[in-house]
């Protein structure tokens, strides 16, 4: 027989919950890495590429040791929502130009969405305060040219890769402390 009616459901082991989040993040990191390699191969673009609308990287070199789970999850979720929006924008704005990357970009968007739902679930399971819904972000301006769009793609994927690498580091460390 299950628990008596009205009794709270036993909450899942937070380590296991965090573990599955780490695995999803690592999987998305690999997808992003592969897509970045393809982008560099098909649309080479030297140098660093920036996009002002992208989130700034959430960490400095020395910050990993001081991370706390609530702040990591909150920041990661906010940053990934921004990257999801940018990937959607990229697919809409650059549909024809990035056709060769389209199946992979679509998969990336789906998996990014899945990770965001997993983060939301983890935050509720850990009884972390839920953030108020984000105010609607101003629409992203279409790229001024095909080349501008390609540079934006480099910036988006490069930034997402770094964010996910940072996230895996932080989550792995935090898991050992739970």
């Amino acid at each position: 027989p299950g628990p008596p009616p009205g009794s709270p459901r036993a909450s899942p082991d937070p380590r296991a919950e965090l573990d599955s989040t780490v695995l999803l993040t690592r999987s998305l990191l690999e997808d992003t890495r592969q897509l970045t390699i393809q982008l560099k191969d098909k649309f080479p673009a030297d140098g660093d590429h920036n996009l002002d609308s992208l989130p700034t990287l959430a960490m400095s070199a020395g910050a990993l040791g001081a991370l706390q789970l609530p702040s990591v999850l909150t920041r990661l979720r906010a940053d990934l929502l921004s990257y999801l929006r940018h990937v959607q924008w990229l697919r809409r704005a650059m549909g024809s130009s990035l056709k060769t990357l389209e199946p992979e970009l679509g998969t990336l968007q789906t998996r990014l969405d899945r990770l965001l739902r997993r983060l939301q679930l983890l935050m509720s399971r850990l009884a972390l305060p839920q953030l108020p819904p984000d105010p609607p972000a101003p629409p992203l301006a279409p790229p001024s040219s095909t080349w501008g769009g390609i540079r934006a793609a480099h910036a988006i994927l490069g930034g997402l890769h770094l964010t996910l690498d940072w996230a895996v580091r932080g989550l792995l460390l935090l898991k050992t402390r739970l």
């Epitope: 690592r26 690999e30 770094l162 895996v168 580091r169 898991k175 050992t176």
Partner: antibody, heavy 119, light 111 residues
Framework: EVQLVQSGAEVKKPGASVKISCKAS????????MDWVKQAPGQRLEWIGD????????IYNQKFTGRATLTVDKSASTAYMELSSLRSEDTAVYYC????????????WGQGTTVTVSS | DIVLTQSPASLALSPGERATLSCRAS??????????IHWYQQKPGQAPRLLIY???NLESGVPARFSGSGSGTDFTLTISSLEEEDFATYYC?????????FGQGTKLEIK
């Protein structure tokens, strides 16, 4: 050709520090992380830590936290590992190896740097 | 930490024979999609060399006589027909969690 070239052998006294370098060539340094692995005589290989060259963010094996410091010089495509408060058990060959956190295997290795700690 | 135990500790075989090396993890290192086990070969005075990644993927440039299999906690490296240059020490490594750890090695010797 993708290569990692490490600095030469070191002999140190107990309590001293050692800093080993690892110069990468043949690939874009910031596209991969750099890991460090210890191999003491007769012991299994032991992972020390990993650093992302772009953000300079290291993670460490708890066993080495506080004594190992991983850094990079992006402009020179070089990674460094410093080990402080040396003791005899630190006598080993230290390797740098190219890795990435998604799957975390090491596909390119340096030739190794022998560190001997002896009074 | 996840502990990897390799067996046998040493194995004496002749060129042309088949070698089967085992690696057992103290907890599962597989997830949906991946088995986080990798195999390396090391010769005296040399650095390890990656042979197999993610349990069964052959690293570029590694001869096809090497293959990997397994999932969960039990993994195998097979060398279908030994060549002179295959006599070395073999290590498995997991990357399922922090920290990644290595097995103690299996030394493959000429009979």
């Amino acid at each position: 050709e993708v290569q990692l070239v490490q600095s030469g052998a070191e002999v140190k006294k107990p309590g001293a520090s050692v800093k080993i370098s690892c110069k990468a060539s043949g690939y874009t340094f910031t596209d991969y992380n750099m890991d460090w692995v210890k191999q003491a005589p007769g012991q299994r290989l032991e992972w020390i830590g990993d650093i992302n060259p772009t953000i300079g963010a290291p993670i460490y094996n708890q066993k080495f936290t506080g004594r190992a410091t991983l850094t990079v010089d992006k402009s020179a495509s070089t990674a460094y590992m410093e080990l402080s408060s040396l003791r005899s058990e630190d006598t080993a060959v230290y390797y740098c190896a190219r890795g990435e956190l998604a799957h975390w295997y090491f596909d390119v290795w340096g030739q190794g740097t022998t560190v001997t700690v002896s009074s | 930490d996840i502990v990897l135990t390799q067996s046998p500790a040493s194995l004496a075989l002749s060129p042309g024979e088949r070698a089967t090396l085992s690696c057992r993890a103290s907890k599962s290192v597989s997830t949906e999609g991946y088995s986080y086990i990798h195999w390396y070969q090391q010769k005296p005075g040399q650095a390890p060399r990656l042979l197999i990644y993610l349990a069964s993927n052959l690293e570029s440039g590694v001869p096809a006589r090497f293959s990997g299999s397994g999932s969960g906690t039990d993994f195998t490296l097979t060398i279908s027909s030994l060549e002179e240059e295959d006599f070395a020490t073999y290590y498995c490594q997991h990357s399922r969690d922090l920290p990644p750890t290595f097995g103690q090695g299996t030394k493959l010797e000429i009979k």
